[in-house]
Interface confidence: medium
Amino acid sequence: APVLPGEDSKDVAAPHSQPLTSSERIDKHIRYILDGISALRKETCNRSNMCESSKEALAENNLNLPKMAEKDGCFQSGFNEDTCLVKIITGLLEFEVYLEYLQNRFESSEEQARAVQMSTKVLIQFLQKKAKNLDAITTPEPTTNASLLTKLQAQNQWLQDMTTHLILRSFKEFLQSSLRALRQM
């Protein structure tokens, strides 16, 4: 089974060392997920030329992937802790259907794909505990997710490769922005 941060013997605190704070655990957890995404991107890039495509060309897609915007309060200018935390949790919840889609998209990194999915679920739980403003967080409708998943899986091979690449790149971008913003909280 995939090892989550904190379960690996290397992560066990040494005698006399300080236990990780909640923020440090979240930070470490996000970096663990980013490591997983990196491994998945490697497999994707090795089997298709999507990684060589220009960002502008890739932008011409109809995927509605979560993205940080100025209004979300997660950037240095206009930073707002509560608004940003809601955006991070909402965004991660929206990414879950896309992470489910990735589950059958990898051969050699199948376990890694599962680890990214499971770690994201744990991260959401961590962050929900941290959030005071829980009523502002909207959870995607299960029926909407189910039909989106069906639609994505019905695409041709080229579009599925493109979708996989876009999900990984967007998720990395979202997690990086989240990581940076959470350090300010």
Epitope: D35, S38, Q76, R169, E173, S177, L179, R180
Partner: antibody, heavy 122, light 109 residues
Framework: EVQLVESGGGLVQPGGSLRLSCAAS????????MSWVRQAPGKGLEWVSA????????SYADSVKGRFTISRDNAKNTLYLQMNSLKPEDTAVYYC???????????????WGQGTQVTVSS | QSVVTQPSALSVTLGQTAKITCQGG??????AHWYQQKPGQAPVLVIY???SRPSGIPERFSGSSSGGRATLTISGAQAEDEGDYYC???????????FGGGTHLTVLG
Amino acid sequence: EVQLVESGGGLVQPGGSLRLSCAASGFTFSSYAMSWVRQAPGKGLEWVSAINSGGGSTSYADSVKGRFTISRDNAKNTLYLQMNSLKPEDTAVYYCAKEGDTGWKDPMYDYWGQGTQVTVSS
Amino acid sequence: QSVVTQPSALSVTLGQTAKITCQGGGLRSSYAHWYQQKPGQAPVLVIYDDDSRPSGIPERFSGSSSGGRATLTISGAQAEDEGDYYCQSADSSGNAAVFGGGTHLTVLG
């Protein structure tokens, strides 16, 4: 137009001190983290120190820790680097750099000053 | 301190494609940013967040990253692209910027 202008460099003896300044204009200085990056003659870039937008959080390269102090005055749109106990290996061009909006602590520099030369020699 | 490694020099024929690579463990969880520096001038950001190009940077510059390896690609290198290119990431704590040693690009012909 974003502008960063460094000053305060010069020739100083080993063990001496210098205070570098970086005057910023063309952007909301108080909203952005700032850094100092140096480049020794014929060498590559080396990150020296960073400070967050409000000035409450700072970080330093191991090579300068305990000797250099970064600070900022948001009212004056100015970044500073106080350099004490200078060593010959501190000889370099010192650049002031603005962190991009993606940079909290994982920094990226979208604008740089032209640099100020610091020479430490007896 | 994280280490980011890149080749010290690279030559490319005018109009051909140049690929500069950068490797380091930190690149798995941090973005790669690329800077161009010409003699006597300050560095200029040419690619940020692995594959994003700042406004004003020619389209021939592109970037990609996977598995702890980042690549800067210059498609159809021009004489004015000659100079030093630095890859930059963050250390494992995210507190410090880490620069590669720089790659000197020579455009032949």
